[in-house]
């Protein structure tokens, strides 16, 4: 059977929300003018064939705008970007499209999410607001990699 | 240029076993799907199974569980294919083949030369 | 488990199109088979030409095109070129696992 994608909504620690900003994902505090993108989350259907015990595999897009996060090198690092892509075309795949998935943790009420392409690199936002959601291997430091989920509907 | 160099051509007694080789260069092998699989004369393809080399998961076709094993170094870039029981049904060319994410889809777009396998006391 | 089928061979012409199909013994192909198309020239040499049912990879000439022609994939040479001839195969995907056909042998004369 085939799943659904569960719309939710991630802040981080610091109540700063998601919101799309020119194609790019940006992390800013919540106001009353502030409309956050609501995120799509579905998890890969091939999980037994990926690594256990590192989170749940989940392809995360953004809602109705056919957008999905992936993982890509830009020179030797690792970036983050949006890429036009329809995120069930991704869960139907025959194989676990990496670049797309990330591992999702779990640790009480935060949630971290870490690249399948690039072990070791999260999705994380700077200490400072309005800035771009990046990938970084500094966890705890200058950025924020602990988000809080919230399902929708 | 993207390359899957496959090892020689093998002469082995039935029973015995095998373990056949295919190295990759020109592309990160641990951002792909190796798989293998079966050429006999005047017969089709045959899907044997894949490596995911990144973390070593693997998938079989049924038919080959339990008769085949594929395994991945990828300290030299090289995926393995071992046969146990080996018998003349398994005398082929068996194929290293990539499969590969490129823009929206799987592709098999690049294939090792094969390895001819032939069994006979 | 499925039988994947394909026309055993095929002759065209130069400049003819031809259409050769894969067809599935457990019902109608769909784009959930994500079918692949891949050529073999003689001296085992294989390539990657299709996708996905169709997309075509990387550098693979725009006169070879894949579809779905009833409950069938099928792989289109829109002006076939003396080149193209070489046994073409088919790969259908069933939930966990790949099937080949045998293969078509397009001859072109």
């Known amino acids: 059977k085939s799943e659904m994608p569960q719309p939710v909504s991630i802040q981080d620690i610091n109540h700063r929300v998601w919101v799309l900003q020119d194609q790019i994902l940006i992390a800013v505090p919540r106001k009353d003018r502030v409309s956050p993108v609501t995120i799509s989350l579905i998890s890969c259907r091939h999980v037994e064939t990926l690594e256990k015990d590192r989170g749940n595999p989940i392809y995360l897009g953004l809602n109705g705008l056919n957008l999905c996060l992936m993982c890509a090198k830009a020179g030797d690092q690792p970036t983050l970007q949006l890429k036009e892509k329809d995120i069930m075309d991704l869960y139907n795949q025959p194989e676990p499209v990496k670049s797309f998935l990330f591992y999702h943790s779990q640790s009480g009420r935060n949630s971290t999410f870490e690249s399948v392409a690039f072990p070791g690199w999260f999705i994380a936002v700077s200490s400072e607001g309005g800035c771009p959601l990046i990938l970084t291997q500094e966890l705890g430091k200058a950025n924020t990699t602990d988000f809080g989920l919230t399902m929708l509907f | 240029e993207v390359q899957l160099q496959q090892s020689g051509a093998e002469l082995v007694k039935p029973g015995a076993s095998v373990r056949l080789s295919c190295t990759a260069s020109g592309f990160n092998i641990k951002d792909t799907y190796i798989h293998w699989v079966k050429q006999r004369p005047e017969q089709g393809l045959e899907w044997i199974g894949r490596i995911d080399p990144a973390i070593g998961t693997t998938r079989y076709d049924p038919k080959f569980q339990g008769k085949a094993t594929i395994t991945t170094d990828t300290s030299s870039d090289t995926v393995h294919l071992q046969f146990s029981s080996l018998t003349s049904e398994d005398t082929a060319v068996y194929y290293c083949?990539?499969?590969?994410?490129?823009?929206?889809?799987?592709?098999?777009?690049?294939w090792g030369q094969g390895t001819t396998l032939t069994v006979s006391s | 488990q499925a039988v994947v089928t394909q026309e055993s061979a095929l002759t065209t012409s130069p400049g003819e199109a031809v259409t050769l199909t894969c067809r599935s013994s457990?019902?109608?192909?769909?784009?959930?088979?994500?079918a692949n198309w891949v050529q073999e020239k003689p001296d085992h040499l294989f390539a990657g030409l299709i996708g996905g049912t169709n997309d075509r990879a990387p550098g693979v000439p725009a006169r070879f095109s894949g579809s779905l022609i009833g409950d069938k994939a099928a792989l289109t040479i829109t002006g076939a070129q003396t080149e193209d001839e070489a046994i073409y195969f088919c790969?259908?995907?069933?939930?966990?696992?790949?099937?080949f056909g045998g293969g078509t042998k397009l001859t072109v004369l």
């Open positions: 457990s019902g109608a192909v769909t784009t959930s088979n994500y």
């Open positions: 083949a990539r499969l590969h994410y490129f823009g929206n889809n799987f592709f098999f777009d690049y």
């Open positions: 790969a259908l995907w069933f939930s966990n696992h790949w099937v």
